[in-house]
């Protein structure tokens, strides 16, 4: 609460996160023209990336384009991309939606459709829907440990959210354990009124707000964090503004002296840890 | 404008960026002693990296050192690095400018020059100028979509820069479309009074400032962002303080059971999105 | 100092860091059943990662699990993980400490011990201590150049920590050169009252605070940074809360058409650059 006689100072914060959990993923795998069910295990090194402290990412879904090579090929026949003659294809043109640079030729994509030929990583990425349900939907049961060190330099005061008395096998709960800093991802979503299973398909951004309202006067000292959660991406966003949260990255390799890559379109939850608050002292 | 009767609160912000664009790169490629012109396509997975929300990087230039192996070799004969006898080479010495640890021997680098032998990734990186013009100079035409969610917790008010009424095919313009949040990289530079083609060679840091000056009183409510742009790195910086913006990263692989790497010195623009402002309410 | 007649404004900051240094690492390497001493050189591309401006990471130690494949194998016999019959193993169970999903079978781990079989990246990671002394303990002699651009938009004032008069071969010293922005990592630790050699084993988080107390009135203008250092992770942290600083990442490759990975558990120092302060003007 506001104490007008106090000198207020904003918090200086550092965050460290640690995600735990394993996901079993079942998907169709095609090898040598034969499609069969494949099972694989994803651990932290597979589904998360070494990001900075105040943000961490958990991959919940993906689409792979394997064995791409830099060459010429027909572009993917998305809406409005088909052609019937070379006139429709403009040499040197880069359609922002396309994945390559047009050569000016209209070529067969398959039996029935023709598209403009492009110089690109081929075959170009198919614009297919993210798998539903999400491949790593079990990430709902992953946990994240959040360590937060705060400082009020003007008051020469430092503290952290984890106290020596805390129990490392706790799980945060708004009522039963509001000071525990180990959070189940599914619980974070529930607290924010969101459905993890749904968001996991396209990805999203979730805010974990840590509010420090610190009274640093010795006679009524109080300085503990309050956690709250809210979704940061717009779930009602128009298609043209790229709903959800995804990014593409590539694994490069050489095969028979040919430079190739596997392109991964990774959908997932980016968790932003937003630390704010003030320290007040007479 | 300052309303002294209002309670002011700083903004809590989360940012999400999405870069679009393809670059065609033409460079000399040497294979089996033969040098020829090579053309390649770079898409987002090739020129950008999954970074946090408030920063994104676009590679505009690079220098590659291919097929490096951990072994002994003569160091690169940069200014002041040549030797004429072993006396000039100190076993175990690591010159901060060098790329390895000296063995104490002075060995031939080429027909005319001798340098200290080092234990390093060999052959050591040549200290050659960044290509001019920049290899991905066409990145000037890439676009970035910036999504910004803001929150004034004390006023329990949340909003975002993208409104449902907005058009996903717009491009930001200071006069004609100042609320559009899709920015052409070249336009950002032009607004900041900088030359993209020039900065692309050595790299640089560009600030995109988003200023929220929010009046949250119901009778005169206003809360929309104002965008401005300024260069953050020092273009007049002395050579010793590393002008521009670059970093090195490596791609590791095995060839005939020998651990090798390709070292990439990536030059580019780091865009920092700096969100600030206040929300005021009676 | 507080000048009550001034209008104060918080700093808007952008940071760029550049680490320099080479480490020679000596470790036991096992090949074809024979263990011998291996020497290798680590440069910036090997021990650091392209992170954002306000944070950088230097790897000081590591544990490798090479040639992992997705298959079935006995889990690592850590404390409490051994079994004597299948009853102790629960099909589909994922122990948060384990690295896989139990099949329900109790199988031999070695001559004397049995553990639950798991579907995982195999062989599973051994829970061995981080090497002591740290493999890259010589990182103590690495240096980091910190470039900091600051802005007070309300006062339309911009400056940076590096002035044209500065010497690029300086090293920060609290007394002799407090404005030099090139820092030896070991010195940072010494200033913070910490032992680099010790922290390098398990990793840690170190704060570099840059304080700008700017008087922007023309008659008594002053705006230069003050650097201070403090450890941000809790060195007395309970084992259950993951002391130190480490993360796992993987290098994926194919061998004889089998997808494999090398898992690296990287320990190191994350340096957080915390910029704060105000600009005051009448």
């Amino acid at each position: 609460s506001d104490k007008l006689y106090q000198r207020k100072e904003p918090v200086i914060s550092s965050v460290h996160t640690k995600v735990k959990g394993i996901a079993e993923v079942t998907e169709n795998v095609t090898e040598g023209g034969v499609t069969k069910l494949g099972h694989s295990i994803f651990d932290t090194a597979d589904y998360t990336f070494p990001l900075q402290g105040n943000s961490f990412f958990v991959m919940t879904n993906y689409v792979k384009s394997e064995g791409q090579v830099q060459t010429l090929c027909p572009e993917y026949p998305r809406r409005g991309a088909q052609c019937s003659s070379d006139r429709r294809c403009k040499k040197g043109w880069m359609d922002p939606q396309s994945k390559g640079i047009q050569t000016g030729r209209c070529v067969p994509y398959d039996k029935t459709r023709k598209t403009c030929e492009v110089s690109a990583w081929c075959p170009t990425e198919e614009e297919k829907e993210a798998p539903r349900p999400a491949l790593l939907r079990s990430a709902e049961n992953f946990t994240v440990l959040i360590k937060n060190n705060i400082h009020f330099p003007g008051h020469n005061y430092t503290t952290r959210n984890i106290l020596p008395t805390m129990n490392g096998s706790c799980t945060f709960h708004k009522t039963w354990d509001p000071q525990c800093s180990i959070f189940r991802l599914g619980d974070i979503f529930q607290e924010a009124g969101e459905n993890f299973t749904e968001v996991a398909v396209q990805g999203g951004i979730m805010g974990i707000e840590i509010y420090w309202d610190c009274n640093l006067d010795s006679w009524s000292h109080h300085c503990r964090p309050r956690y709250s959660f809210r979704r940061l991406d717009d779930k009602n966003m128009d298609e043209s503004f790229v709903p959800g949260y995804n990014f593409r990255y590539a694994k490069y390799y050489k095969e028979n002296n040919v430079e190739k890559r596997t392109l991964i379109k990774a959908f997932g939850i980016r968790f932003d840890i937003l630390v704010f608050g003030t320290g007040g002292k007479f | 404008s300052d309303k002294l009767y209002q309670r002011k609160e700083p903004v809590i912000s989360s940012v999400h960026t999405k870069v679009k664009g393809i670059a065609e790169v033409t460079e000399n490629v040497t294979e089996g002693g033969v040098t020829k012109l090579g053309h390649s396509i770079f898409d987002t997975a090739d020129y950008t990296f999954p970074l946090q929300g408030n920063s994104f990087f676009v590679m505009t230039n690079y220098v590659k050192s291919e097929g490096q192996v951990q072994t002994l070799c003569p160091e690169y004969p940069r200014r002041g690095a040549q030797c004429s006898s072993d006396r000039r080479c100190k076993k175990g010495w690591m010159d901060p400018q060098s790329k390895g640890i000296q063995t104490g021997r002075c060995v031939p680098y080429d027909k005319t020059r001798k340098t200290c032998e080092v234990s390093a990734w060999c052959p050591t990186e040549e200290e050659k100028e960044a290509p001019r013009p920049a290899l991905l100079r066409s990145a000037e035409n890439f676009t970035v979509l910036i999504k910004n969610n803001i929150h004034f917790p004390g006023h329990n008010y949340t909003t975002r820069n993208i409104l449902p009424t907005m058009n996903g095919s717009c491009t930001f313009h200071k006069t004609w479309d100042p609320q559009c949040s899709i920015f052409r990289l070249g336009d950002i530079f032009q607004e900041a009074g900088e030359n993209f083609t020039e900065v692309a060679v050595q790299g640089g840091i560009m600030g995109i400032e988003i200023y929220w000056d929010c009046n949250l009183d119901s009778w005169s409510h206003h809360c929309r962002p104002r965008y401005s742009f300024r260069r953050l790195d020092d273009k007049n910086m002395d050579e010793s303080f590393v002008p521009g913006y670059n970093f090195r990263y490596a791609k590791y692989y095995k060839e005939n059971n020998v651990e090798k790497r390709t070292l990439i010195k990536a030059f580019g623009i780091r865009f920092d999105i700096l969100v600030f402002g206040t929300g005021g309410k009676f | 100092s507080d000048k009550l007649y001034q209008r104060k404004e918080p700093v808007i900051s952008s940071v760029h860091t550049k680490v320099k240094g080479i480490a020679e690492v000596t470790e036991n390497v096992t090949e074809g059943g024979v263990t011998k001493l291996g020497h290798s050189i680590f440069d910036t591309a090997d021990y650091t990662f392209p992170l954002q401006g306000n944070s950088f990471f230097v790897m000081t130690n590591y544990v490798k699990s090479e040639g992992q494949v997705q298959t079935l194998c006995p889990e690592y016999p850590r404390r409490g993980a051994q079994c004597s019959s299948d009853r102790r193993c629960k099909k589909g169970w994922m122990d948060p400490q384990s690295k896989g999903i139990q099949t329900g079978r109790c199988v031999p781990y070695d001559k004397t011990r049995k553990t639950c079989e798991v579907s995982a990246w195999c062989p599973t990671e051994e829970e061995k201590e981080a090497p002591r002394p740290a493999l890259l303990r010589s990182a103590e002699n690495f240096t980091v150049l910190i470039k900091n651009n600051i802005h007070f938009p309300g006062h339309n004032y911009t400056t940076r920590n590096i002035l044209p008069t500065m010497n690029g071969s300086c090293t920060f010293h609290k007394t002799w050169d407090p404005q030099c922005s090139i820092f030896r990592l070991g010195d940072i630790f010494q200033e913070a009252g910490e032992n680099f050699t010790e922290v390098a084993v398990q990793g840690g988080i170190m704060g570099i605070e840059i304080y700008w107390d700017c008087n922007l009135d023309s008659w008594s203008h002053h705006c230069r940074p003050r650097y201070s250092f403090r450890r941000l992770d809790d060195k007395n942290m309970d084992e259950s809360f993951v002391p130190g600083y480490n993360f796992r990442y993987a290098k994926y490759y194919k061998e004889n058409n089998v997808e494999k990975r090398t898992l690296i558990k990287a320990f190191g120092i994350r340096f957080d650059i915390l910029v704060f302060g105000t600009g005051g003007k009448f």
């Epitope: 090579v69 060459t71 027909p74 081929c122 075959p123 | - | -």
Partner: nanobody
Framework: EVQLVESGGGLVQAGGSLRLSCAAS?????MGWFRQAPGKEREFVAG????????RYADSVKGRFTISRDNAKSTVSLQMSGLKPEDTAIYYC???????????WGQGTQVTVSS
């Protein structure tokens, strides 16, 4: 699924020539040839994009083999000259989405080069 029928295989002396042909049941962006020698894996030989652009050859056949195609007829042929005993294999016609990527294969035709 695309149907592919190869023809033109046979026995030939080292240094001789042979022409393989392949007809596809429908038009396709790229057509190419692979081969498999006894006890070895199937390997790429030559490929051609639409209208013969681009073409790609394995290093071992460069300068000796020439691929050509007729889009109108959905056919591809492989002119092989300067044949060597190590060219002995079953040759397969294939179609795909680029000169590096093939999805459909023919039944194959035997080529034997005697020394």
């Amino acid at each position: 699924e695309v149907q592919l029928v190869e023809s033109g295989g046979g026995l030939v002396q080292a240094g001789g020539s042979l022409r393989l042909s392949c007809a596809a049941s429908e038009r396709t962006y790229s057509m190419g040839w692979f081969r498999q020698a006894p006890g070895k894996e199937r390997e790429f030989v030559a490929g051609s994009g639409w209208d013969g652009i681009p073409t790609r050859y394995a290093d071992s056949v460069k300068g000796r083999f020439t691929i050509s195609r007729d889009n109108a007829k959905s056919t591809v042929s492989l002119q092989m000259s300067g044949l060597k005993p190590e060219d002995t294999a079953i040759y397969y016609c294939a179609t795909g989405t680029s000169v590096y990527h093939y999805q459909y294969w023919g039944q194959g035709t035997q080529v034997t080069v005697s020394s």
